[in-house]
Each structure stands twice: as structure tokens, then as C-alpha cells.
Interface confidence: low
Amino acid sequence: EVEKTACPSGKKAREIDESLIFYKKWELEACVDAALLATQMDRVNAIPFTYEQLDVLKHKLDELYPQGYPESVIQHLGYLFLKMSPEDIRKWNVTSLETLKALLEVNKGHEMSPQVATLIDRFVKGRGQLDKDTLDTLTAFYPGYLCSLSPEELSSVPPSSIWAVRPQDLDTCDPRQLDVLYPKARLAFQNMNGSEYFVKIQSFLGGAPTEDLKALSQQNVSMDLATFMKLRTDAVLPLTVAEVQKLLGPHVEGLKAEERHRPVRDWILRQRQDDLDTLGLGLQGGIPNGYLVLDLSMQEALS
């Protein structure tokens, strides 16, 4: 808490300008009118205040707006935003996309902070939905933000936003999220030719159904083992040995190293051993020759 002291004669601030950087903390508290600061917030960014001075300016705004800052002030916070706590931000009602962009710009290049996460949450709640413009903005600043959304929230992500996503931004997505993102990625990249398409869609294939994996197997894509291991087990199981061989191309040899891990392990159990033997990899655990394979899943579904 800054102690209340009278402003020295001649030091009362008439406007927010560079002369204030020479003020001590107690002088800023005493000589800068909070209402003046609020109306000239846009100038603060251009002045090289110290962090300690910024603390004083924040304190003045907090006193003026105990219920939360108005958007006219929030939009011009600039690097003063970095001083805000999530508790401060929860008091705000941010509805303008320009305000959101201005504050995200301040944090650009850094990991998503608790302040930014709270800001985004407040903004989305204020708008009532994740509209296209909001998502375009959020994915431009934080492509990894997609994986922080629930599958229900992801359903309103426009395919155009997918272009901003980098492979590493999907690292934290779980299969349920990829189930939602994959059809959007397929739509976003649909006009690319086969090889370019595969490069782009590869990160999303954890949400691909069997039919699409079968189609990809006809296109000489040479999927790497890391991608194959992230595929849905239920999508991999119906693939034949020949389809997996085509899908992986030269990477098929990597199956041996992964034979004890899902989905390879479960897939091996579904294949005839003589089919597996054609790969020449020494994969074991397939259905012995001469055994009859009954698919009971359809029977269960009907009963």
C-alpha cells in the first residue's frame, strides 16, 4: 500500500508524459490524478516507466475502478496488462475483439500466462460463443489453444483456423479432441495435392477413421511410425496387412520395435499369422493358420 502524501508544489501532472518517469513512487501516487490516467492510458505504453512505477499506476486505477476497469481503459493497458492478476481480470467485461488483440499483442511470443487464459475465458464468456473472428485471433496468437478447448467447444472452430496450427500445437490434444479437429483439417486442406495434403493432415490423423486410412494407403504416403502409433486403435484394427504395408511404405520395418505397444499389439492379434509372415519382420501373435475368425461385434450391436 502506498502511503498518502500531499503532492509537492508545481508537480501536479497536467498530462501523462515523459516527465513522470523522474517521479518517485510516492510522487506518482500523490500527483497523478486517476481519472487523468484513465483517459490517457494510451500514452503509458510510450513512456519507459519502471515496474515499480507501473505498480503505482495500477494501484491508482484499482482505486478508481474497484469493480473492474471499463473497456476503454482495458484496451489501452499495454504492458500494464502484465501487472494484472487473474483476480483483476475476472472483474472485467471484455467484448471488443480489438481489445483482446491489443492485450494478446503485449504477451506475444510468450507462453499463455494465467492472465491471458483468464482474459480469453472472460472474452469468450462475454461474447457467448466461440465465433470465427475470435477463433482466428486466438489461433493466430496461440495455436495450442485449440487443445485447451473441450470437444464441444471445438465443434465451433472454423476449418479456416486450422491453417494456423503447427504440429507441435497438437501434442497436448487427446483423441476426443482430434476426432473433432480431423474432419475440419481435412476440409481445410482439401484442395492440396496428395503429397502436400498428407504433410498437412499428418498431425491430425489421430482422429482419422478406418476408411480414410485405407484411402491414404493407396497413395504412397509413407507414414512414419510415430504418426502410426498415434492413430486410433479402433481405426487401425480393420486394416489388412497389405494396407498397413502400403500405408507405412519403407517404415513398415518399424513395426517390429513396436509390436508390444498399442495399436500395433492389438492389430497383430487381429491378423492371420501367415499374412503377418509375408512382411518378413518376425511379428508374432497373429491368428494361427486354420483357425476360423468370427466377428462378434456385429452380433453384439444387433442384440
Epitope: P159, P183, K184, R186, L187, F189, Q190, M192, G194, Y197, F198, I201, E211, D212, A215, L216, Q218, Q219
Partner: nanobody
Amino acid sequence: EVQLVESGGGLVQPGGSLRLSCAASGYIYGFYAMGWFRQAPGKGRELVASINSIDSITYYPDSVEGRFTISRDNAKRMVYLQMNSLRAEDTAVYYCAARYIAAGFGYWGQGTQVTVSS
């Protein structure tokens, strides 16, 4: 297995209209783009309209823009091509086609003949 069956072709006078229908069955319908191609005698196949399955974005070449309209009915698993202001040069066999996104149009119907003549 994917199956596409066209109907609605026939003989029509210049300036007239026709509506072609395509019934789609199999996994393909909800996940692929659908299109209409035509092939006139002695010429190659030409795309005249396509529609994306998810967002229904449409595409038309300049030769039919403003005259042809492609549409779809998800519930009935149908794709339609409404052809207005038909010209003699529109005479061709019209094929319904389905497109796997990474591979181009790979599934075709048997075709339906459209003849524009007075």
C-alpha cells in the same frame, strides 16, 4: 462400397431447363466432396459443378456460372444439378462423381445423357 446413380437426363430445347439427381450410398457421403462432370462426344471430361460435403461451398467454371446450380440433401443422400438456359454446347453425358479429398474425384456414376436440340 460406394455407389452413385444419376437420373433426370433427357432431350430439351435450347433455353430450357433440366434437373439432374444423384443418389449416393456408402461411407462416402458425409465426408467427401461431390461433383458433376460432363463429357461431350470426342472430348474429355469437364467439371461443371462441385459442392463440399461439410460446409457446402460450391464451385462452377465460367462456362456454366449463373446457369447451373449444385445442391445437396443430406437426409436423402442426394446431390442435384439444376441446369437453366441450356445451350446446344451443353449436350453431353453428365456424370455424378465423389471425391476423396487427397485423391481427386475417384468414384463415378454410370452417367445420364443430356441433349439440347431444337
